[in-house]
Every structure is written in structure tokens, then in C-alpha cells.
């Protein structure tokens, strides 16, 4: 867990000719506010896609009235930082959108009017706990200068906020195998409580015994890279022998949305539509008041003076959702089926279908295996709108053309050591265990508990798994 912090330094005309007109006037005084939207990874996503890492709205800036005849100066800014709390690990790579909004304070019927002045976006790499990073972005004739950083909330530390720190139990040193927590040298790393074997680079845990994967990794121990899987289904879990993602539960199975939120699948993941009073990626944030600025895109917050009374966001035209977080466009009606991506071409809508689907609305499930060949003795398996090759041992990938590492999923039980072999894998069992995967304990009286060792092999000898 941690907080992404954004400090806006200035917003004003950029260099060069064509200075923008001041957004405010004596007749129409206005003030600025900012919205930041964060998404994990470096994906090129539409501005309207969910802010999966979180979003924040600044306070309103001071009222500004243009001086007649004067060029537009840097405009007065709201005080303070924009802070976006993140609950899980910091992904290290992220995309951001920063919007500059104008609130007009003239005699508007029905209250103030909001309009988007500028939107900048970018993709960055950032380690948590590092120094402030400075940036300049231009949107048309406007220029935005800002700094940002990600910091972990105690007891989390590290570049991804996945290591936990605890105060030292002894004054001089940390316990065995535990390092001091830089920069908190008076604290020690907490003992690892994740599931045994959980990848330290690609996995993390918040509860003892669990192993949750960072974006781009899957499998029970977060050791299988999603990107190298060539199976076409975007769903986990992983297949131990092929390193390939096989169709599994959908992102909405088991409803990841808390507090009565409803889940809908998106081309990349899922989206929660939260009931009033809750927001966040999984509707996990509650106790929100209007003072927290929960209404995005210029939505007007009503009620919610204290955490026990729900707020209501009155959305400006063109936005919807309990927090006005969703832009209403012609793709909002979700014409594309089976995870197809909707593209508004202006004169018409088009669906870009996921592999294995076709038709104007991606409504046709293709004959998955027609004309498909699986190499190296693999067989084609239909299902889920995307053909999948069930590969022979030692091979993986979409068409079984890649050599697979059969040991990647740590198949040898009870501390057995795995060796890749031309025909699969070999487990060298720890003393006291036997079996192809070292799954059977050897009884003290010398009899094994099923099955008997093949002739010529002593318990504990490496056995080839065919």
C-alpha cells in the first residue's frame, strides 16, 4: 500500500507563438482544478478506460479574473498535493492522465459550469520511495509543469511497497535472515509470510500464505509471464507444463467488487460499478464525503457531509457512474460482444474482435481448430473462442513451437529438486520421499505408501516423469 503524490507547479501558456486566450474574464470569472487518473502498466488506453490504480481531484483554485488586454499568465493554482492512494503493490510502470478543469463562476443557471481546458497523458517508470520526478507536458497552447512520486505507507517498503517493516525487537540487530529496512534503519524487514515459493519479484501478499501477482505475471507462484504465453485466452490460471494460459474463471467470477458493487468484464480486466458511498477499483473505499472530492469530470457533489451520510454526484452531461467517472459516448452501450473493443470512427462504430471471434459485433465464435496446426506432436483443443494447443511434454507456446521449462512451476513436492529433461522433467527427491513428483513419503519400515518403486530404482533416486 502507498500513495502516489502529484504536485502541480504551474499551468499557463506554453512557449512559442499563439498564446491561448485567458480562460477567465471580468464577465466570467473562473477557477481551476485538476484531476489525475492512474492506470497500471504502459498500455495505450483510451482516456475513458477505468483509472485502475486510482484517481484524485484537487481542491478548487483561487478565483481568477482576466486583466483586460493582458496576456494569459500562469493561472492561480489550488493548494496542496493530489494524492492517489493505492492498496496493492506499486506496479513500477504506470500511465497517467492529468486534466485541467475550469469552473466558471458567472451567473450560471443551475450552478457553476465546468469545462475541460487541457488533458495531458504519459507513460512512465517510477520506483516507490524515490525522489520527486519533474515533468513538463503540453496540451495545445497550454503548458503544465508538475512533479510526482510514489511513497509507501508503513509498514510497507521497497520499490513496489511489497516488503513489510516492523520495529526492531532487539536494539542492535535484526533477526536471522532479516535485513534492516532502508531508509528506516531502526526497523527490520518483517518475516516473509507469503505462500512458499511465491516469486519475490513478481508476487506479493497481504495475508499470510497468499501469493498475488503483479501485472504481467500469473500462476500460483506468479512465476509464469503472461506476455510469453501464446494461448489466446486472456484468463488464468497457468498450465504447469506449457507455461500457457488456459481458459479459467472470468475476471468477474466470484465478484471482485465489494460493498454491493456490480462487476462487468472489460477487454482487459473488469470494472466495478459502485453503489453510492463507495468507490475505488473494487468499491473498497468508503466513508467518503464531499470534502474528499469524489465526483470526477466536474460532477457536483451533494450531501455526504459526514462519512455516515452518502454523497450523490450530479454528473455534467456526457458523464455517468456513481462518481461521474465514465464518459458517455457511443461505445458506452457496449455493442461489441465477447470482449471485443469498440472503436468510434465518427461515421460508424467498429468492433475489433478478440482472437477466435468474428462478425460485426464479434458475435460469431470461430471454429477454433479449423486450419490450425499444433507443432511437435501437440493437439488442438477448442473452446473459449480461441484455439489452444495441448502441447507434448517439453514444448509450449501457442503452437507448441517453443521449448518449455517444465520446472518453472516447481512440480517436485517436499523439497525435491527438478531437472529439465528432453522428455519432460526429472525430480530428485529429498530423503524420505519418492514418486515421480516426490509426492509419496517413504515409510520408516522401508515400505513405501504407494506405489512400489519400479525395479532397479531405490527410493530417493531420481525418477523420470514420462
Amino acid at each position: 500500500a502507498g500513495v502516489f503524490e502529484l504536485q502541480i507547479h504551474s499551468f499557463g501558456p506554453g512557449p512559442g507563438p499563439g498564446a491561448p486566450r485567458s480562460p477567465c474574464s471580468a464577465r466570467l470569472p473562473c477557477r481551476l482544478f485538476f484531476r489525475v487518473c492512474l492506470k497500471p502498466g504502459l498500455s495505450e488506453e483510451a482516456a475513458e478506460s477505468p483509472c485502475a490504480l486510482g484517481a484524485a481531484l484537487s481542491a478548487r483554485g483561487p478565483v481568477y479574473t482576466e486583466q483586460p488586454g493582458a496576456p494569459a499568465p500562469d493561472l492561480p493554482l489550488p493548494d496542496g498535493l493530489l494524492q492517489v492512494p493505492f492498496r496493492d503493490a506499486w506496479p513500477g510502470t504506470f500511465s497517467f492522465i492529468i486534466e485541467t478543469w475550469r469552473e466558471e463562476l458567472g451567473d450560471q443557471i443551475g450552478g457553476p459550469a465546468w469545462s475541460l481546458l487541457a488533458r495531458v497523458a504519459g507513460r512512465r517508470r517510477l520506483a516507490a520511495g524515490g525522489p520527486w520526478a519533474r515533468d513538463i507536458q503540453r496540451a495545445g497552447a497550454w503548458e503544465l509543469r508538475f512533479s510526482y512520486r510514489a511513497r509507501c505507507e508503513p509498514p510497507a517498503v521497497g520499490t513496489a511497497c511489497t516488503r513489510l517493516c516492523r520495529p526492531r525487537s532487539a536494539p542492535s540487530r535484526c533477526g536471522p535472515g532479516l535485513r534492516p529496512c532502508a531508509p528506516l534503519e531502526d526497523e527490520c524487514e518483517a518475516p516473509l509470510v507469503c505462500r512458499a515459493g511465491c516469486s519475490p519479484e513478481h508476487g506479493f501478499c497481504e495475508q499470510p500464505g497468499e501469493c498475488r501477482c503483479l501485472e504481467g505475471w500469473t500462476g500460483p507462484l506468479c512465476t509464469v509471464p503472461v506476455s510469453t504465453s501464446s494461448c489466446l485466452s486472456p484468463r488464468g490460471p497457468s498450465s504447469a507444463t506449457t507455461g500457457c494460459l488456459v481458459p479459467g474463471p472470468g475476471p468477474c467470477d466470484g465478484n471482485p467488487c465489494a460493498n454491493g458493487g456490480s462487476c462487468s468484464e472489460t477487454p482487459r480486466s473488469f470494472e466495478c460499478t459502485c453503489p453510492r458511498g463507495f468507490y475505488g477499483l473494487r468499491c473498497e473505499v468508503s466513508g467518503v464525503t464531499c470534502a474528499d472530492g469524489p465526483c470526477f469530470n466536474g460532477g457536483l457533489c451533494v450531501g455526504g457531509a459526514d462519512p455516515d451520510s452518502a454523497y450523490i454526484c450530479h454528473c455534467p452531461p456526457g458523464f455517468q457512474g456513481s462518481n461521474c467517472e465514465k464518459r458517455v459516448d457511443r461505445c458506452s452501450l457496449q455493442p461489441c460482444r465477447n470482449g471485443g473493443l469498440c472503436l468510434d470512427l465518427g461515421h460508424a462504430l467498429r468492433c475489433r474482435c478478440r482472437a477466435g471471434f468474428a462478425g460485426p459485433r464479434c458475435e460469431h465464435d470461430l471454429d477454433d481448430c479449423a486450419g490450425r496446426a499444433c507443432a511437435n506432436g501437440g493437439t488442438c483443443v477448442e473452446g473459449g473462442g480461441a484455439h489452444r494447443c495441448s502441447c507434448a511434454l517439453g514444448f509450449g507456446g501457442r503452437d507448441c513451437r517453443e521449448r518449455a521449462d517444465p520446472c518453472a512451476a516447481r512440480p517436485c513436492a517436499h523439497g525435491g529438486r527438478c531437472y529439465a529433461h528432453f522428455s519432460g522433467l526429472v525430480c530428485a527427491c529429498a530423503p524420505g520421499y519418492m514418486g515421480a513428483r516426490c509426492e509419496f513419503p517413504v515409510h520408516p519400515d522401508g515400505a513405501s505408501a504407494l506405489p512400489a518403486a519400479p525395479p532397479g530404482l531405490r527410493p530417493g533416486d531420481p525418477q523420470r516423469y514420462l
Partner: antibody
Framework: EVQLVQSGSELKKPGASVKVSCKAS????????MNWVKQAPGQGLEWMGI????????IYNHKFKGRFVLSVDKSSNTAYLQISSLKAEDTAVYYC?????????????WGQGTTVTVSS | DIQMTQSPSSLSASVGDRVTITCHAS??????MGWLQQKPGKAPKGLIY???NLEDGVPSRFSGSGSGADYTLTISSLQPEDFADYYC?????????FGGGTKVEIK
């Protein structure tokens, strides 16, 4: 032949609710959105909202949020408009009109209209 | 919301006349608009979609043109059955909006 057949006229008291139906035939119901349009006596047309029958996703005109609910029953190829807490100003003819979900043709086929009269 | 300003609000014409109705959108709508015909006591009927395309079964004397924010419906030779109300509608952006209507009456 494409047809949209709406339910009959309704006379309701203020505060009551009404549910207008629009039964579609002659085309694949889930391939076309359904729009609802209001026409008050002697007035022009006013768009109320739209529903995707395949997914049930709706978008409302912000003037018609709250008391107005659009829904569909895919098994009977029927779209519904429900209005609760009726007021005198809800007196109007309500039309359903289909619209292609991708090519965005304008509303090419319309129901015959359902007159809703709200009077005490 | 996009405003659709239709003119004239009414016109009188004779059979055989060429009639032109215009619609101006408060912002560009890229041809995402249509024209509807409504006769008294009847439901509207689609005439034109995408600014210039005739709906199935609509006589060729009806035509649509325009781009950006300005669009025109033309009836090249008015027929007795064409006396009705005509509406433009934009479907570029939610909420969809209609013009105020043009009543075409017999002179």
C-alpha cells in the same frame, strides 16, 4: 417485416406508475438498440434514453433520470419503459424506435406510440 | 447538449414545389444525423440517415445533404402525401436531440 408494436393507451392518476411495452418482430432483437422518445401534446420530439437489448446497458437523457427505467425481456423480444411517481407533465405519447447498434442508422422503425394520460 | 435549430418552423407550398428545410447543430456532428417525417396522429418515420442516405422505401424525391453543423432536407417535387411535420435528429452524441420541427402545409 420489421414491426414494433406498443401497448395500449393508459389513464393514470398522479403518483401512480405505468409500464409501456414495445414488442419487436421481423429482425434480430439484440442487434438493434431501442430508443424511447416522448412527444407531449402539440410539442416536438424529445429523446428519453436508449437500451442495448443484448447487454441491458442503458443511457438516459439527464432530463429523464430517476423516475424513468428502461428494460428488456430478450425471451419475448420486448422492450419496456417504466415511469413511476407520475406527474401531469408526463402526459404524452411515448414511442419506441430501433436503431442499428453499429452503423448508427437513425431511428428507422418506430412503434405506433402509447398515449399516457396523467389526470386526477 | 447539442442544440438542433431547424428552420423554417412552418412553410406553405403547393404540389410540385421544391421544398428545402435546414437544420443547424450547435457543434459539428460529422453527418451523424437523420430526417424524420411525422403525419398527424401517426408515429414518426425515418427518411434519411447519415445526413444523405435514403431509408428503405423512401421515394427518391427526398434527398439530404450537408456536413459539419449544417444540413438540408430537400423535397424536389412536393406530393400530396408529403404534407406533414419534419424533424431533424442528431445521434453524434448523447443525449440525442431533435430539431423543433417544420410543418409543411398546403398553400
Amino acid at each position: 417485416e420489421v414491426q414494433l408494436v406498443q401497448s395500449g393507451s393508459e389513464l393514470k392518476k398522479p403518483g401512480a406508475s405505468v409500464k409501456v411495452s414495445c414488442k419487436a418482430s421481423g429482425y434480430t432483437f439484440t442487434d438493434y438498440y431501442m430508443n424511447w422518445v416522448k412527444q407531449a401534446p402539440g410539442q416536438g420530439l424529445e429523446w428519453m434514453g436508449i437500451i442495448n437489448p443484448y447487454s441491458g446497458v442503458t443511457i438516459y437523457n439527464h432530463k429523464f433520470k430517476g423516475r424513468f427505467v428502461l428494460s428488456v425481456d430478450k425471451s419475448s423480444n420486448t422492450a419496456y419503459l417504466q415511469i413511476s411517481s407520475l406527474k401531469a407533465e408526463d402526459t404524452a405519447v411515448y414511442y419506441c424506435a430501433r436503431q442499428d447498434s453499429l452503423l448508427d442508422y437513425a431511428m428507422d422503425y418506430w412503434g405506433q406510440g402509447t398515449t399516457v394520460t396523467v389526470s386526477s | 447538449d447539442i442544440q438542433m435549430t431547424q428552420s423554417p418552423s412552418s412553410l406553405s407550398a403547393s404540389v410540385g414545389d421544391r421544398v428545402t428545410i435546414t437544420c443547424h447543430a450547435s457543434q459539428g456532428i460529422s453527418g451523424n444525423m437523420g430526417w424524420l417525417q411525422q403525419k398527424p396522429g401517426k408515429a414518426p418515420k425515418g427518411l434519411i440517415y447519415h445526413g444523405a442516405n435514403l431509408e428503405d422505401g423512401v421515394p427518391s424525391r427526398f434527398s439530404g445533404s450537408g456536413s459539419g453543423a449544417d444540413y438540408t432536407l430537400t423535397i424536389s417535387s412536393l406530393q400530396p402525401e408529403d404534407f406533414a411535420d419534419y424533424y431533424c435528429v442528431q445521434y453524434a452524441q448523447f443525449p440525442y436531440t431533435f430539431g423543433g420541427g417544420t410543418k409543411v402545409e398546403i398553400k
